[in-house]
């Protein structure tokens, strides 16, 4: 375990002073819920003989509407909160004048993240406390002093799961066009172990880094017409909930076993990713279950191996790729990582190399489309928050959407005294308005049966005393006596 190891340092970097372009004028007295970070922002960076102009937009789809944070309180009890009305400072966008460019940055305390121009991936981070106008380092990933990291998923296991791999099955698509299908959504639950917490030092620092990482992963997946939305964050600020071993395969098994036990009382999610400060044995930085997305084994473990969060973001994108059925690029004869990027630079390369990858190869995209043809992949079809991702909330449509606490239909039809039908907010004194664990506007006490067993493999569910809805339907794993 290496929670005290120093972060890797840059070997070579340029110093830049970002300049924020003046945006549209806004009134000085902003309502407090709008926060300090504008919806859109542009910066000019003078780097590598160019002036790069970054046009950024706040990633409004970063957090699901029911996003929760779980940690251990000072008294030792586990606390799950649903932070409300939080502003954030995580942005995505492009570089002016470069058609296939991409950018993913946080602006919370200076600029930190990446921007991609042609075949160059530039990383940026603050050098001092001077905020967004202060001194920043701009550098390329190969100038980080770090060793190459590898994926622990073995080629043998991939072969048995994915079958023969030849280029014949891969139909290259012209240019970088998005797959012509509905956007898919990965509802992601991130667990941060105690070693990582110790390394970062506070819940706030962990939250910041995780949001930064997920913002980057989401940006990498957007080219595949995927969105990655964080629905839950669990920080082991007191102690680990299971043994995090330097052997990544052991840690993954422990994660999946733990997740199966916790699933009924934790947020609904499609995929769980552990970020650990433990140094995995050898050069391995990640390990995943292949083609497990949407199943009880949907998850992976990731070592936070680089000073810049883009490092662990690339690892997470890679391991999530395995969850989505992707193989290592080297294993596929004729696999093409777009011509303008040299070999080994794509996300599903078996080794992360010294330069962080920034795109998926043709064969990764084909594996993904093949996985999406399976009935198993249906969990990716639902937008995590209907109201936000596919249109504004409508009070009175029976769907409890962003900003609503209840929805009992139009005022003339509503017969629910717990819900104010004109505002879709709870009536005065009401704790709840919907759900099998809601009775007469109050949450039922813990232990009350809310879903009986359907058959011998099913498990009965009980109200938890905190939520108006019955926990997710759980069942015994096959082979359980």
């Amino acid at each position: 375990i290496a929670p005290s190891r120093p972060w890797a340092l840059m070997e070579q970097y340029e110093v830049v002073l970002p300049w924020r372009l003046p945006g549209p004028r806004v009134r000085r007295a902003l309502p407090s819920h709008l926060g300090l970070h504008p919806e859109r922002v542009s910066y000019v960076l003078g780097a590598t003989g160019h002036n790069f102009t970054l046009h950024l937009r706040k990633n409004r789809d970063l957090l699901g509407s029911g996003y929760t944070e779980t940690y251990t309180a000072a008294n030792g009890s586990e606390v799950t909160e649903q932070p409300r009305g939080q502003d954030h400072c995580f942005y995505q966008g492009h570089v002016e004048g470069y058609p296939d460019s991409a950018a993913s940055l946080s602006t919370c305390a200076g600029l930190r993240g990446f921007f991609q121009v042609g075949s160059d991936l530039h990383l940026i981070e603050p050098l001092d406390e001077g905020g967004e106008g202060g001194r920043h380092a701009v550098y390329q990933a190969e100038h980080l002093l770090q060793t190459a990291g590898t994926c622990g998923v073995s080629d043998d296991s991939l072969g048995s799961l994915l079958g023969p791999r030849t280029a014949a099955v891969f139909r290259p698509r012209p240019g970088d066009s998005l797959p012509s299908r509905e956007t898919r959504y990965v509802e992601l639950y991130v667990v941060v172990d105690n070693a990582e917490f110790q390394m970062l030092g506070s819940e706030a620092a962990v939250r910041h880094r995780v949001l930064e990482v997920v913002n980057h992963v989401d940006k990498l997946y957007q080219k595949l017409n995927f969105r990655v939305v964080l629905v839950g964050l669990e920080i082991w600020n007191s102690q680990d909930r299971f043994h995090v071993s330097p052997d990544p395969s052991v840690t993954l098994e422990n994660l999946l076993t733990w997740q199966a036990r916790q699933r009924t009382r934790r947020h609904l999610h499609d995929n769980v990713q552990l970020i650990t400060g433990v140094d995995f044995t050898g050069t391995t930085v990640g390990f995943a279950r292949v083609s497990a997305m949407c199943s009880h084994s949907s998850g992976a473990v990731n070592q936070d191996h680089s000073k810049n969060p883009v490092g662990v973001a690339c690892t997470m994108a890679h391991e999530m790729g395995h969850n989505l059925g992707m193989d290592h690029d080297e294993n596929v004869q004729g696999c093409r990582c777009q011509e303008r990027f040299e070999a080994g630079r794509c996300i599903m390369a078996g080794s992360i190399g010294s330069s962080f990858p920034r795109m998926f190869s043709d064969c990764s995209q084909a594996y993904l489309e093949s996985f999406l043809e399976r009935p198993q992949s249906v969990c990716l079809a639902n937008a995590p928050d209907l109201s936000h991702l596919v249109g504004g909330p409508v009070c009175g449509n029976l769907f409890v959407e962003r900003g609503e606490q209840c929805d009992c239909g139009p005022p003339e039809d509503c017969r629910n005294r717990c819900c104010n039908s004109t505002t879709c907010q709870l009536a005065e004194g009401a704790q709840c308005a919907h759900g099998t664990c809601c009775q007469e506007c109050k949450v039922k006490p813990a232990g009350e049966l809310c879903r009986p067993k359907k058959d011998m493999c099913d498990l009965e569910e009980f109200c938890d005393g905190r939520h108006p809805e019955c926990p997710e339907d759980a069942f015994q794993e096959n082979g359980t006596p």
């Epitope: 509407s65 609904l268 937008a383 449509n397 409890v400 039809d413 759900g435 809805e469």
Partner: nanobody, 118 residues
Framework: EVQLVESGGGLAQAGGSLRLSCAAS????????VGWWRQAPGTQREWVAS??????????YVDSVKGRFTISKDNTKNTVYLQMNSLKPEDTAVYYCC?????????CGQGTQVTVSS
């Protein structure tokens, strides 16, 4: 995981009718509500109509379809229908069936295309 499958889309003349079906893989009574959304090219998906699936049936509609569209359900077939009459060219869109069983969480189908020609 719940699966919703839409069918019944197609080409219709202005003033004509279509009936969309949404078949659920499980019992629709396990949901709080089932609804239809639609999305025309280049626009955000908009809510069209919903139906409560247990207790007294409530059927709200977006103003633009009131009096023309009717949402209904058949609990025995685990299916929700959208009867669309007096169709207009502006009703052209992909129609999605969505279901909700808990706050801030919905399942949606893959959609069915409806094209209304003038």
């Amino acid at each position: 995981e719940v699966q919703l499958v839409e069918s019944g889309g197609g080409l219709a003349q202005a003033g004509g009718s279509l009936r969309l079906s949404c078949a659920a893989s499980g019992s629709i009574t396990s949901f709080n509500a089932v609804g239809w959304w639609r999305q025309a090219p280049g626009t955000q998906r908009e809510w069209v109509a919903s139906i409560s699936t247990s207790g007294s049936t409530i059927t709200p509609y977006v103003d633009s379809v009131k009096g023309r569209f009717t949402i209904s359900k058949d609990n025995t077939k685990n299916t929700v229908y959208l009867q669309m009459n007096s169709l207009k060219p502006e009703d052209t869109a992909v129609y999605y069936c969505c279901a909700t069983e808990r706050m801030h969480h919905s399942y949606c189908g893959q959609g069915t295309q409806v094209t209304v020609s003038s």
